[in-house]
């Protein structure tokens, strides 16, 4: 039975040219996290595997950095980065948990981070 829940940074905004941290956190389960996949709509951005470490898709290597933790840092943001991002937690024995984050990249300097939890 899947008892876990994924907490995410929710809907967030950031300035064009800036960077943002995408964070998810799996709680309320003792399941072992074996892998976390990060996707942007229909594109695989990165994978963090418990044994193999990080794999960043080559087409995103210059703008995506692993971490902190199981999170993902997006750099040199453009308005085209606006959209949905998904963290997919592969766990044993529970199975798969998915979290959703919506990022809006703004032209102006009025971008604010709306977050459900603090990013250190």
């Amino acid at each position: 039975m899947m008892t876990g829940t994924i907490e995410t940074t929710g809907n967030i905004s950031a300035e064009k040219g800036g960077s943002i941290i995408l964070q998810c956190h799996l709680s309320s389960t003792t399941a072992q996290v074996t892998q976390v996949n990060w996707e942007q709509q229909d594109q695989l951005l990165a994978i963090c595997n418990a044994d193999l470490g990080w794999h960043i898709s080559p087409s995103f290597k210059d703008r995506v950095a692993p971490g902190p933790g199981l999170g993902l840092t997006l750099q040199s943001l453009t308005v085209n980065d606006t959209g949905e991002y998904f963290c997919i937690y592969h766990t044993y024995p529970d199975g798969t948990y998915t979290g959703r984050i919506f990022l809006e990249v703004l032209e102006s300097s009025v971008a604010e981070h709306g977050a459900r939890f603090q990013i250190p």
Partner: antibody, heavy 118, light 107 residues
Framework: EVQLLESGGGLVQPGGSLRLSCAAS????????MHWVRQAPGKGLEWVAS????????YYADSVKGRFTISRDNSKNTLYLQMNSLRAEDTAVYYC???????????WGQGTLVTVSS | DIQMTQSPSSLSASVGDRVTITCRAS??????LNWYQQKPGKAPKLLIY???SLQSGVPSRFSGSGSGTDFTLTISSLQPEDFATYYC?????????FGGGTKVEIK
């Protein structure tokens, strides 16, 4: 250098059993999911089964479920496929393949031929 | 199960030609799509993974594109060693499934 070497193929009668092995070298075997893929003569590729790093999860194609068992021995760097109740339609070259991140199959063995015939 | 439909099933081309092979999934598979090359009597070889990432050691004339349900493998300038059969494969969910293959023959 990554190497995968299958063995155990051969001629077997319908209803018989066979155990395939895949000896791995050149990488940390226990860190990777492993797969069996087969190819009937003159046909395309068909995924058969896969096993996660620590044997925690095993997956099978419907066509072999209940007849084939995938297993691994990380201390011996070896992948196995126990095939029971074999049928003529199981005749194929069987390949083992490494599956990093459970997303692609980057290294394949040379294959071992299984022929099921009376 | 996710069905993978490849087209064409075969094609004839000349050295230097630009060749395009398409693969369609029966449901969205994000970018969990890989391409393999197989020559007679040999094991398949990974060319492209995650729809568009070139596997290490594979010539840059091979490229992949697409996401969701429609994907393309392109060989920009066909070389003599490229005459082979090409397969797409989805890894979005088990069972993993392959396309039926595209045989690239010499015209």
């Amino acid at each position: 250098e990554v190497q995968l070497l299958e063995s155990g193929g051969g001629l077997v009668q319908p209803g018989g059993s066979l155990r395939l092995s895949c000896a791995a070298s050149g990488f940390t075997f226990s860190s990777y999911s492993m797969h069996w893929v087969r190819q009937a003569p003159g046909k395309g590729l068909e995924w058969v089964a896969s096993i996660k790093y620590s044997s925690s999860n095993k997956y099978y194609a419907d066509s072999v479920k209940g007849r084939f068992t995938i297993s691994r021995d990380n201390s011996k760097n070896t992948l196995y496929l126990q095939m029971n109740s074999l049928r003529a339609e199981d005749t194929a070259v069987y390949y083992c393949a490494r599956g990093p991140y459970d997303v692609w199959l980057d290294y394949w063995g040379q294959g071992t031929l299984v022929t099921v015939s009376s | 199960d996710i069905q993978m439909t490849q087209s064409p099933s075969s094609l004839s081309a000349s050295v230097g030609d630009r060749v395009t092979i398409t693969c369609r999934a029966s449901q969205s598979i994000s970018s969990y799509l890989n391409w393999y090359q197989q020559k007679p009597g040999k094991a398949p070889k990974l060319l492209i993974y995650a729809a568009s990432s070139l596997q290490s050691g594979v010539p840059s004339r091979f490229s992949g594109s697409g996401s969701g349900t429609d994907f393309t493998l392109t060989i920009s300038s066909l070389q003599p060693e490229d005459f082979a059969t090409y397969y797409c494969q989805q890894s979005y969910s088990t069972p993993l499934t392959f396309g039926g293959g595209t045989k690239v023959e010499i015209k």
